[in-house]
């Protein structure tokens, strides 16, 4: 299936040009999306091109400025947040990135009634997290690992926690491992629906081993960065959940929510919190051996001012073939009765589907079914449930939005997006207003992305929010590569692949092949999305064929494929890349003397193992910030898929699956190893150990480090990185510069 045909005709040939590396590094062909900042059923805020904050009313067609760019500029604000009572706006400035999601910032509160900043009892700086209550204009914020509450922006703060300590006790914000591997947020506090209660997590990292690395900066002596970071098998953070009444915070103080007995009996994690009503909350817990998850519904007991979590309201989710959930355990979406809920988990055939749980998980009613997967539940209203799946036309790498009418019997299903812009749009997400009165659809491809606004009752398109016209015009004279998404059937395994082909691709010719791999558990690389990136340039200008393959361990094609890698990472992911390469050679247009593989992070691990597989298939390859041994990576992630590195569990495979164990096998390939020295995620240690093993084996290789750069290798390092990798590949493929 050719998704993006090249627009080359003889008459145009001399005006058309190939992509350049400069195009990619400058972001010349980047696209825009439009996500409304919903403030009601029919209103949203948006930051205009000239930086005014504008309110749009869909029903009246009006739009008006609520905050001028002058006010924004006066404090150098880069972000804002309107209080639910519409009286105040917080303005965020001095953004300072910490880890993937976390950052600190300075916050100013602007009073919209008088057009002035709130003076007196100003917020301290820098703040780690700040948010409005869902009703009114209470503020909760985290400063120096402690939580504070303000009833009104101008009021003095009430301090909720006192034990917060850098790198030791975290209140209302996650520690490193919870941020990256469990919550995927910068916050760990949750307001109840009407702002009566505030729930928060406390993480105790006192006993966690610390990763320490040098940050060189430009001082005489480097700084040492210390992060409590539990590697596989190490001591983990201890988590506790508390809830405080924000109306009378001093009256009873924070009340701890009890952990289910079956969870508390051994090491465990807290995985998410969902408020149901102001007096009912749902907590999800996970055993350290991550195949058992417990969902616990707790109720406020007015008489005791405590939270009660009866055993009858505990729902267990267990996997016998792998780990619980997909990447994370899914979260519940509660219905209007405030006790039953909808949740995605594996059905009896091993496909993730939506289930309706009224009393017990055993009696769950399956809402969706088929040899495809439900991916996200966006919204449940009185009469509709909106979700995304990859059902349409049996392409796992697509995402369409569906509506199930739950108000009628039997429930009827309608695909909202399948036929809207069928060629252009096959990968959607959505953003819903209150009560799903309206929603925005954001289409990511395969054509140029487009964002549209729709009526929540009729699904009618109201207007285009962003169609990337400038990008469309800019691409008119560019020879883009062709892209196709197809599948290989090998030994009862389906391997979906995306192939990116040079603009004048000719099947009778031979082309160098570059495999781009990620391959991590529950990931997906073969997606019907638009991208003009480095590999687009390599196909367009340098005449390479690039392929991405989703092998065993990847997501959204059922548990058989997903859980195939359970307890044995580094085996089947690599095998499936190699199998695909052999199939590509059989297609007849690949020069088998010029095949390379590259990947980043988990992809760097897979590419390293593929190069060291001893097949002789690969001439060269690149590993960027690779994992080299699972003993070096984070406990929460690693143990989910590998179990523990102990003799009586899975130590043997931990040892067998390292890159270092295969050092000898790099002798006959050209290997480029790249890592940032300040990588807080996949520590530089990983590449240091690969390099040491290669040196000890007297194997030649190339390497590049990026001083003081983290896992993302951003800024000027990005330009240097892609330039360096381009030279390496062109040399490997004997392409002239």
């Amino acid at each position: 299936i050719v998704l993006r045909p090249s627009r080359v005709h003889n008459s145009e040939e001399n005006t058309m040009r190939a992509l350049t590396l400069k195009d990619i590094l400058n972001g010349t062909f980047s696209y825009k999306t439009f996500f409304p900042n919903w403030i009601s059923g029919q209103e949203y805020l948006h930051q205009s091109a000239d930086n005014n904050i504008v309110l749009y009313n869909i029903e009246t067609g009006q739009s008006y400025t609520i905050l001028s760019n002058r006010t924004m500029k006066s404090v150098n604000a880069s972000n804002y947040g309107l209080s639910p009572d519409r009286q105040f706006v917080y303005l965020e400035s001095d953004y300072s990135k910490l880890w993937r999601y976390s950052y600190t910032a300075t916050y100013y509160i602007y009073d919209l009634s008088n057009g002035e900043f709130v003076r007196g009892n100003e917020l301290p700086r820098p703040i780690q997290y700040l948010c409005w209550s869902p009703v009114g204009s209470k503020l909760a914020y985290v400063y120096q690992n402690n939580i504070y509450l303000k009833q009104r922006p101008g009021d003095p703060p009430f301090q909720i926690t006192f034990n917060g300590r850098e790198n030791k006790i975290f209140n209302g914000i996650p520690d490193w491992v919870y941020e990256e591997e469990m919550l995927a947020t910068k916050y760990a506090l949750w307001w109840s629906p009407n702002g009566k209660f505030l729930a928060y997590a406390e993480f105790n990292d006192t006993d966690i081993p610390v990763i320490a690395y040098s940050y060189y900066g430009d001082e005489q002596y480097p700084r040492t960065i210390n992060i409590p970071y539990p590697k596989a098998g190490a001591k983990n953070p201890v988590v506790r959940i508390f809830i405080i009444d924000t109306t009378y915070p001093a009256y009873v103080g924070p009340q701890e929510v009890p952990v289910p007995a079956m969870i508390a009996s051994s090491d465990y994690y807290f995985s998410w919190l969902t408020w149901v009503t102001d007096e009912r909350v749902c907590l999800q817990w996970l055993k350290r051996v991550q195949n058992v998850s417990v969902l616990s519904i707790c109720d406020f007991r007015e008489d005791w001012q405590t939270w009660d979590c009866p055993k009858t309201q505990e729902h267990i989710e267990e996997s016998r073939t792998g780990w619980a959930g997909g990447f994370f355990v899914s979260t519940p979406v509660f219905s209007y009765d405030a006790i039953s809920y909808y949740k995605i988990f594996s059905d009896k055939d091993g496909y993730k589907h939506i289930h309706y749980i009224k009393d017990t998980v055993e009696n769950a009613i399956q809402i969706t079914s088929g040899k495809w997967e439900a991916i996200n539940i966006f919204r449940v209203t009185q009469d509709s449930l909106f979700y995304s799946s990859n059902e349409f036309e049996e392409y796992p790498g697509r995402r369409n939005i569906y509506r199930i009418s739950i108000g009628s019997y039997p429930p009827s299903k309608k695909c909202v997006t399948c036929h809207l812009r069928k060629e252009r749009c096959q990968y959607y997400t959505a953003s819903f207003s209150d009560y799903a009165k309206y929603y925005a659809l954001v289409c990511y491809g395969p054509g140029i992305p487009i964002s549209t606004l729709h009526d929540g009752r009729t699904d009618q398109e109201i207007k285009i929010l962003e169609e990337n016209k400038e990008l469309e015009n800019a691409l008119k004279n560019i020879q883009l590569p062709k892209e196709e998404i197809k599948k290989l059937e090998v030994d009862e395994i389906t391997l979906w692949y995306k192939m990116i082909l040079p603009p004048q691709f000719d099947r009778s010719k031979k082309y160098p092949l570059l495999i781009q791999v990620y391959g991590g558990p529950c990931s997906q690389s073969v997606r019907s999305v638009f991208a003009v990136n480095w590999i687009s340039y390599l196909a367009s200008k340098e005449g390479m064929v690039i392929a991405l393959v989703d092998g065993r361990g990847t997501a959204f094609q059922g548990d058989k494929l997903l859980y195939a890698v359970y307890r044995k990472l580094g085996v089947y992911e690599v095998e499936d890349q190699i199998t695909a390469v052999r199939k590509f050679i059989e297609m007849g247009f690949i020069d088998e003397k010029r095949i390379a593989i590259w990947g980043w992070s988990y992809g760097g691990y897979v590419s390293s193992l593929a190069l060291a597989s001893g097949t002789g298939l690969f001439k060269c390859g690149i590993a960027v910030a690779p994992v080299s041994s699972w003993e070096y990576y984070a406990s929460v992630y690693t143990e989910r898929f590998m179990g523990l590195p102990t003799k009586d569990d899975n130590l043997e495979h931990y040892k067998n699956s390292t890159v270092m164990a295969r050092a000898e096998y790099f002798r006959n390939v050209d290997y480029l190893l790249i890592h940032g020295t300040a990588d807080d995620n996949v520590h530089f240690q990983n590449s240091a150990q690969i390099a040491k093993a290669l040196v000890n084996a007297q194997v030649d290789f190339q390497a590049m480090w990026y001083s003081d750069q983290n896992h993302g290798l951003s800024g000027l390092s990005t330009n240097h990185l892609y330039t360096h990798m381009t030279h390496f590949l062109k040399q490997c493929f004997s392409l002239s510069d």
């Epitope: 009601s40 209103e43 309110l55 009313n57 009246t60 008006y64 057009g115």
Partner: nanobody, 115 residues
Framework: QVQLQESGGGLVQAGGSLRLSCAAS????????MGWYRQAPGKRREWVAT???????NYADSVKARFTISRDNAKNTVYLQMNSLKPEDTAVYYC?????????WGQGTQVTVSS
């Protein structure tokens, strides 16, 4: 062009009542969230009350249980019923959208409460 006309102010004794009206024209109607605001002499303008499109109301602590905001969708008018008035309620009262339109305030209506 958005136009909001406040009326109904006046001089009243402490403990008395007044009913303010805000007539909306242009594209403003029941599909907008509306608010009443006030500015006392020598003080900053402050929010008083809000009514949403669905009729949900919200009040400043200082006026709770004394003031009532309402709307008549047919007449495109928003009201503020003020009971048990106090001298500290003396101010110029304005109506606007909520959140208010940036830099767009009418003349307001003066309310004076004598002791």
């Amino acid at each position: 062009q958005v136009q909001l006309q406040e009326s109904g102010g006046g001089l009243v004794q402490a403990g008395g009542s007044l009913r303010l009206s805000c007539a909306a024209s242009g594209s403003i109607d029941s599909r907008n969230t509306m608010g009443w605001y006030r500015q006392a002499p020598g003080k900053r303008r402050e929010w008083v009350a809000t009514i949403t499109t669905g009729g949900r109301t919200n009040y400043a602590d200082s006026v709770k249980a004394r003031f009532t905001i309402s709307r008549d969708n047919a007449k495109n008018t928003v009201y503020l019923q003020m009971n048990s008035l106090k001298p500290e309620d003396t101010a110029v009262y304005y109506c606007n959208l909520a959140p208010p339109i940036f830099n767009s305030w009418g003349q307001g209506t003066q309310v004076t409460v004598s002791s």
